[in-house]
Interface confidence: medium
């Protein structure tokens, strides 16, 4: 197979440490202009499976503030604006990367961590278990 | 005042370069047991705003594979299983952190990047603009 040549301008890394620890540039390239989930859309209010956004805050993590969706109802909102319990509001989850300081109190040493967050809710047909 | 002492095991940093670059340990602490979005739930099929999951792959990014949701319909699925265009299927988006190799093809040098991904879809009441 074809191997992409290693860029000669790469920082050095000793095999014994690679790839456990890498250098990361903090000049974050942000492809998005709006980072506030409440501003980005009002889907959380207009959805047939509406949700509330709760602030999950941890000063020892980056990002320190993560918004977690909690579905407002067990059922879904029908055309009359009432909750229909024949349908279910369920959270849509996403696994995201965060950075946590490690070892503690080191200003420039971090570990990647994966956490599961609920981003919003969707309305699904329930799985019905029929008893014989 | 009292300063938290700097951990003696911290990586060194020269003031002129610090804090643009930090060390990140890639031994990811994963708080989740299930990482495959197709396995984690079948909501994408059971939703009234169903979606398909598309594989977005980039070897110069970590994680190299990200699953992107694309809503199947403009409308939502009604109780009869038909698409109701009086409602809208819309993507729920989440801003996530990724690592991008920089310079390209360097195995241990990255830049933090924020990208917006569609995680799933939800069914919303449309905003109707009335013409006078």
């Amino acid at each position: 197979g074809i191997t992409i040549p290693r860029n000669p301008g790469c920082p050095n890394s000793e095999d014994k440490n690679f790839p456990r620890t890498v250098m990361v540039n903090l000049n974050i390239h942000n492809r998005n202009t709006n980072t506030n989930p409440k501003r980005s859309s009002d889907y959380y209010n207009r959805s047939t499976s509406p949700w509330n956004l709760h602030r999950n805050e941890d000063p020892e993590r980056y990002p320190s503030v993560i918004w977690e969706a909690k579905c407002r109802h067990l059922g879904c909102i029908n055309a009359d604006g009432n909750v229909d319990y024949h349908m279910n509001s369920v959270p849509i989850q996403q696994e995201i990367l965060v950075l946590r300081r490690e070892p503690p109190h080191c200003p420039n040493s971090f570990r990647l961590e994966k956490i599961l967050v609920s981003v919003g809710c969707t309305c699904v047909t329930p799985i019905v278990h029929h008893v014989a | 005042g009292i300063t938290i002492p700097r951990n003696p095991g911290c990586p060194n940093s020269e003031d002129k370069n610090f804090p643009r670059t930090v060390m990140v340990n890639l031994n990811i602490h994963n708080r989740n047991t299930n990482t495959n979005p197709k396995r984690s739930s079948d909501y994408y099929n059971r939703s009234t705003s169903p979606w398909n999951l598309h594989r977005n792959e980039d070897p110069e990014r970590y994680p190299s594979v990200i699953w992107e949701a694309k809503c199947r319909h403009l409308g939502c699925i009604n109780a009869d299983g038909n698409v109701d265009y009086h409602m809208n299927s819309v993507p729920i988006q989440q801003e996530i952190l990724v690592l991008r190799r920089e310079p390209p093809h360097c195995p241990n040098s990255f830049r933090l990047e924020k990208i917006l991904v569609s995680v799933g879809c939800t069914c919303v009441t449309p905003i109707v603009h009335h013409v006078a």
């Epitope: 903090l26 993590r61 320190s64 | 005042g1 804090p19 930090v22």
Partner: nanobody, 119 residues
Framework: EVQLVESGGGLVQPGGSLRLSCAAS????????MYWVRQAPGKGLEWVAE????????YYVSDVKGRFTISRDNAKNSLYLQMNSLRAEDTAVYYC????????????WGQGTLVTVSS
């Protein structure tokens, strides 16, 4: 939603003083380091001062040390910058910023307050 609102800027003569304030909301103010950063006309952003969550530790960029004092009131969710012996080169838009564990990386800024030092 995280909000930072600065005030207190204005026109001042060289050698004069100003006190900038920043009102914070939408996060647990007392848990985070806070910063003042500035942008002089036609220049890039420059870090000015940092204060740790308890207020007991402060850091300053070398050219403001001894002239500027950063402080905070966690009960009022407020950050301050006392600026004395102001110089023409201190002319800039001053922003307060919420700290993150990533050193000198800010996700949230205020809208800024303009400080003009001129005779």
């Amino acid at each position: 939603e995280v909000q930072l609102v600065e005030s207190g800027g204005g026109l001042v003569q060289p050698g004069g003083s100003l006190r900038l304030s920043c009102a914070a909301s939408g996060f647990t103010f007392s848990s985070y380091s806070m910063y003042w950063v500035r942008q002089a006309p036609g220049k890039g952003l420059e870090w000015v001062a940092e204060i740790k969550p308890t207020g007991s530790v402060q850091y300053y960029v070398s050219d403001v040390k001894g002239r500027f004092t950063i402080s905070r009131d966690n009960a009022k969710n407020s950050l301050y910058l006392q600026m004395n012996s102001l110089r023409a080169e201190d002319t800039a838009v001053y922003y307060c910023a919420k700290g993150e564990i990533l050193p000198l990386y800010f996700d949230y800024w205020g809208q800024g307050t303009l400080v003009t030092v001129s005779s």
